[in-house]
């Protein structure tokens, strides 16, 4: 038997992936656990193996189909269970009736690239990945720039309240190394949250021209 508190949190990426994290206080040593998904109105069901991500938490991704296929809608309810092996039987450790479009977390933006860089400004673009066509252009973004001598947590957040997959960073210092990240969020869903931050994009501003005022 397992004592202690348990937390089971899952998010839908809006297309064909449900990612889950299960944390359990009284840690289970060497126990095989999985997440099982049973939709109420679909012919498929899916399982993924929970793998440790820390001392007392496990994670896995339920792959529902091809990455850009629309596997669920607003009326779907998916029963998600954490099952752990106890001898020859499986024990239900956690259960939830999951409404996918109330629990959205999109994939991190991808393909970040510097479009144009100058001494004081830099134009950066990116793409969104596996976002449902239901959202059309109605997404919001947050971006942040890492300056020398600062941490990501100190970086001010820039908010883009529309599906704008580029940004022009201004008032940068010449000949300076920066890093840039962006994340995305749809408008829909009571428990919807920001995507993970993108992989950081490193860039360097151009040096100021010699003898010119900077």
């Amino acid at each position: 038997a397992v004592n202690g508190t348990s937390q089971f949190t899952c998010f839908y990426n809006s297309r064909a992936n449900i990612s889950c994290v299960w944390s359990q206080d009284g840690a289970l040593q060497d126990t095989s656990c999985q997440v099982h998904a049973w939709p109420d109105r679909r012919r498929w069901n899916q399982t993924c193996e929970l793998l440790p991500v820390s001392q007392a938490s496990w994670a896995c991704n339920l792959i529902l189909g091809a990455p850009d296929s629309q596997k669920l809608t607003t009326v779907d309810i998916v029963t998600l269970r954490v099952l752990c092996r106890e001898g020859v039987r499986w024990r239900v450790m956690a259960i939830q009736d999951f409404k996918p479009f109330e629990n959205l977390r999109l994939m991190a933006p991808i393909s970040l690239q510097v479009v144009h860089v100058e001494t004081h400004r830099c134009n950066i673009s990116w793409e969104i990945s596996q976002a449902s066509h239901y959202f059309e252009r109605h997404l919001e973004f947050e971006a942040r720039t890492l300056s020398p001598g600062h941490t990501w947590e100190e970086a001010p957040l820039l908010t883009l309240k529309q599906k704008q997959e580029w940004i022009c960073l201004e008032t940068l210092t010449p000949d300076t190394q920066y890093e840039f990240q962006v994340r995305v969020k749809p408008l829909q869903g009571e428990f919807t949250t920001w995507s993970p931050w993108s992989q950081p994009l490193a860039f360097r501003t151009k040096p100021a021209a010699l003898g010119k005022d900077t």
Partner: nanobody
Amino acid sequence: QVQLVESGGGLVQTGGSLRLSCAVSGSHFISDVMGWYRQVPEKQRELVADMADGNSAKYADSVKGRFSILRDSVKNTVYLQMSSLKPEDTGIYYCKAGLWIAGRHSDYWGQGTQVTVSS
């Protein structure tokens, strides 16, 4: 402004058939589910049948094998083919559409069409 227009209701004898249709029109939207609900006096509106994207149909137990739902996503129209009708199928039939507008999802209802099955 979104509008749902239902048609096809009427009076029919026990064992007879009817075909309801409901068309959604209006400003820019994406539909992910359309269906039919039934209301009888002193009772809550209840699901008869609906169809979500991916051809995922859901039917009330009481109509399985007798009613069939068909959705035309291009025309934004949903049909309910009702056969082997019974007096207990009598009620006001409402069309419901789940629509995505400007990145948010909402449910929209039609005005209802009366179906009466006489014995």
